[in-house]
């Protein structure tokens, strides 16, 4: 996972990276494989009904440093992990939802699971 302290000017890769994509496959993907000059990612977030949804795919080099930084968003439970070390490396990423804060129970809707 990329850490906050990493450089904000990512170095261009000399070669294309292939990633698994799920719920996030661009038009130029084939057999749930996309290609990128940036990073592979896996993300988990809550949908409108509070259920966890996992998506994965490719992030282009432009702006991916920011997207991979996983900055907390108020009132949104979401976690993203990025990788570049090998093709389809995001198959092995398993981000987890950040824990619920107390006020989330108060502010948010009540879900029965």
């Amino acid at each position: 996972k990329k850490e906050d302290g990493e450089s904000t000017a990512p170095t261009p890769r000399p070669k294309v990276l292939r990633c698994k994509c799920h719920h996030h496959c661009p038009e130029d993907s084939v057999n749930n494989i996309c290609s990128t000059d940036g990073y592979c990612f896996t993300m988990i977030e809550e949908d409108d009904s509070g259920l966890p949804v996992v998506t994965s795919g490719c992030l282009g080099l432009e702006g991916s440093d920011f997207q991979c930084r996983d900055t907390p968003i108020p009132h949104q439970r979401r976690s993203i992990e990025c990788c570049t070390e090998r093709n389809e490396c995001n198959k092995d990423l398993h981000p987890t939802l950040p824990p619920l804060k107390n006020r989330d129970f108060v502010d948010g809707p009540i879900h029965h699971r």
């Epitope: 000399p14 070669k15 294309v16 130029d28 494989i33 000059d37 490719c58 080099l61 432009e62 090998r86």
Partner: antibody, heavy 116, light 112 residues
């Protein structure tokens, strides 16, 4: 300078298999994909597939799945393509080519002749 | 598969003339990263192809500035401003946006 060395010619009998080689030099072998391209006279260029030497990850043109198998030996910076169950349709020039986001260097090609 | 249609098939020119070769793809070559992976190669008789232009308009190292590439989406052009004898051969366009990667059928540049 970047060089991709391929044997000039191979003669094989129908039904047999052949393993074509491509020795890379002048760059870090694992930093680029290696592609293979087929060229028959009057038939243009056909992309067979590619392999990433850093993790042996392969992508094939559906048309060549079962026909071509791509491998690498990183210790000798050599890429290989095995072609099986050869027929006269496989007679062609086969190029290896270095690929990052586009092919920038090509080997000189191996002329494969399938004949009894 | 993306079909790359090249025109003309043959282009007779006089030395010093300008030459234009066209390439049309059956679908857009704009990649999801925003890049357009359309490239041009020259193959001389008995040789392997050599890269001239990558990503539509970027000249590869050592390629003379009389070669230029342009276009977007599905329509692309290679221009040679003043044809020299060493430019004769077969020109191919190629796309690496969509797998499987595909090539144009080639344009043979020859002397009139």
């Amino acid at each position: 300078q970047v060089q991709l060395q391929q044997p000039g010619a191979e003669l094989v009998k129908p039904g047999a298999s052949v393993k074509l080689s491509c020795k890379a030099s002048g760059y870090t072998f694992t930093s680029y994909w290696m592609q293979w391209v087929k060229q028959r006279p009057g038939q243009g260029l056909e992309w067979i597939g590619e392999i990433d030497p850093s993790d042996n990850y392969t992508l094939y043109n559906q048309k060549f799945k079962g026909k071509a198998t791509l491998t690498v030996d990183t210790s000798s910076s050599t890429a290989y393509m095995q072609l099986s169950s050869l027929t006269s349709e496989d007679s062609a020039v086969y190029y290896c080519a270095r690929f990052g986001y586009y092919v920038d260097y090509w080997g000189l090609g191996t002329t494969l002749t399938v004949s009894s | 598969d993306v079909v790359m249609t090249q025109t003309p098939l043959s282009l007779p020119v006089s030395l010093g003339d300008q030459a234009s070769i066209f390439c049309r793809s059956s679908q857009s070559l704009v990649h999801s990263t925003g890049n357009t992976y359309l490239h041009w190669y020259l193959q001389k008789p008995g040789q392997s192809p050599k890269l001239l232009i990558y990503k539509v308009s970027n000249r590869f190292s050592g390629v003379p500035d009389r070669f230029s590439g342009s276009g977007s989406g599905t329509d692309f052009t290679l221009k040679i401003s003043r044809v020299e004898a060493e430019d004769l051969g077969v020109y191919f366009c190629s796309q690496s946006t969509h797998v499987p990667f595909t090539f144009g059928s080639g344009t043979k540049l020859e002397i009139k």
